[in-house]
Interface confidence: low
Amino acid sequence: LRLLDHRALVCSQPGLNCTVKNSTCLDDSWIHPRNLTPSSPKDLQIQLHFAHTQQGDLFPVAHIEWTLQTDASILYLEGAELSVLQLNTNERLCVRFEFLSKLRHHHRRWRFTFSHFVVDPDQEYEVTVHHLPKPIPDGDPNHQSKNFLVPDCEHARMKVTTPCMSSGSLWDPNITVETLEAHQLRVSFTLWNESTHYQILLTSFPHMENHSCFEHMHHIPAPRPEEFHQRSNVTLTLRNLKGCCRHQVQIQPFFSSCLNDCLRHSATVSCPEMPDTPEPIPDYMPLW
């Protein structure tokens, strides 16, 4: 978890002088509670946005937006703490909006946005906005939380972000697998425009089971430049096991941008359909 660039972040708007600061996720008001605290945020919305860094890289970011309730507690609102928690790692990152001037009611509802938390493909986050100061112990909570799921690199917009492109998202191998005679599989896929090696991982299963009955790894050396974008054809020999007929073929590239952590592509071959054995027709029809 990180912030997009570390340039000056702004939260000021007409009628409010505000600065964005790093936060330890433990606001001082937890330790020194105040008597009067503001109410909770209203209508917290989290959306997936995309932002360019100063270097020109494109990253997915969490666009956080919320409004204030129209009550007198805005007179005691000193700022907000924005917290993003990555659920599978428990990593948390916070920033603090510090209001340098008092809020006043005006003809429009106050609205705040922040779009600088960089998020990772295929990850889930919990986003929390806490109004400051935080409530006294046993006081009414003045925060709002929402979960936010980031699509994986298959998503059309995500595919062209820097983290996805670094893991090989633009490569479409268009894998085809056909079963040949004599217990063989013919695997064909399109090479990418990089002189790097590939690995084909074959796992075979019985018809209705999930325990593998055969595994095989096939190494494909780095292609020459004239072979880029060409089809690579590989014939794999299967183990001659009756019923070991369902195959998963996975192709793992080793691009320089992602090394051994590149996106893999796979294709499956189902077991052949068994023809229904028809009921035997008797030679004669009984007359009774």
């Epitope: 599978n88 796992t203 595994e215 051994n260 952590d261 893999r264």
Partner: nanobody
Framework: QVQLQESGGGSVQAGGSLRLSCAAS????????MSWFRQAPGKEREGVAG???????KYADSVQGRFTISRDNAKNTLYLQMDSLRPEDTAMYYC????????????????????WGQGTQVTVSS
């Protein structure tokens, strides 16, 4: 790319216990499945225990009921608690990680891992 570093190996008498740790570091933007493998001299590397990113576990028949795999996502660490150790458990133990959330039935297949540690030696004497 993920780097893995095992620790906790050593020598122990049969019936004793050891706890192996595997610290993962490096940029990871995806979920990972992780496993412990072992390789005795002159033998093939075999899967011992695996866990996917949903926390589903899989054990080799030879260690079922004696070994326990767990992971601490906050610390990016994988553990293997080994109890009732036997001389046949003597081997070099390797930690492995693979990107994506793997089916539980493939967790002990070494072909589905793309990052490996250097290994830690476990010796069980009778």
């Amino acid at each position: 790319q993920v780097q893995l570093q095992e620790s906790g190996g050593g020598s122990v008498q049969a019936g004793g216990s050891l706890r192996l740790s595997c610290a993962a570091s490096g940029y990871t933007s995806k979920t990972y499945h992780m496993s412990w493998f072992r390789q005795a001299p002159g033998k093939e590397r075999e899967g011992v225990a695996g866990i996917n990113s949903d926390g589903v576990t899989k054990y080799a028949d030879s260690v079922q009921g004696r070994f326990t795999i767990s992971r601490d996502n906050a610390k990016n660490t994988l553990y293997l608690q080994m109890d009732s150790l036997r001389p046949e458990d003597t081997a070099m133990y390797y930690c492995a990680a693979g990107s994506g959330n793997m089916f539980d039935f493939l967790l002990l297949s070494r072909h589905h891992y793309n990052a490996w540690g250097q290994g830690t030696q476990v010796t069980v004497s009778s």
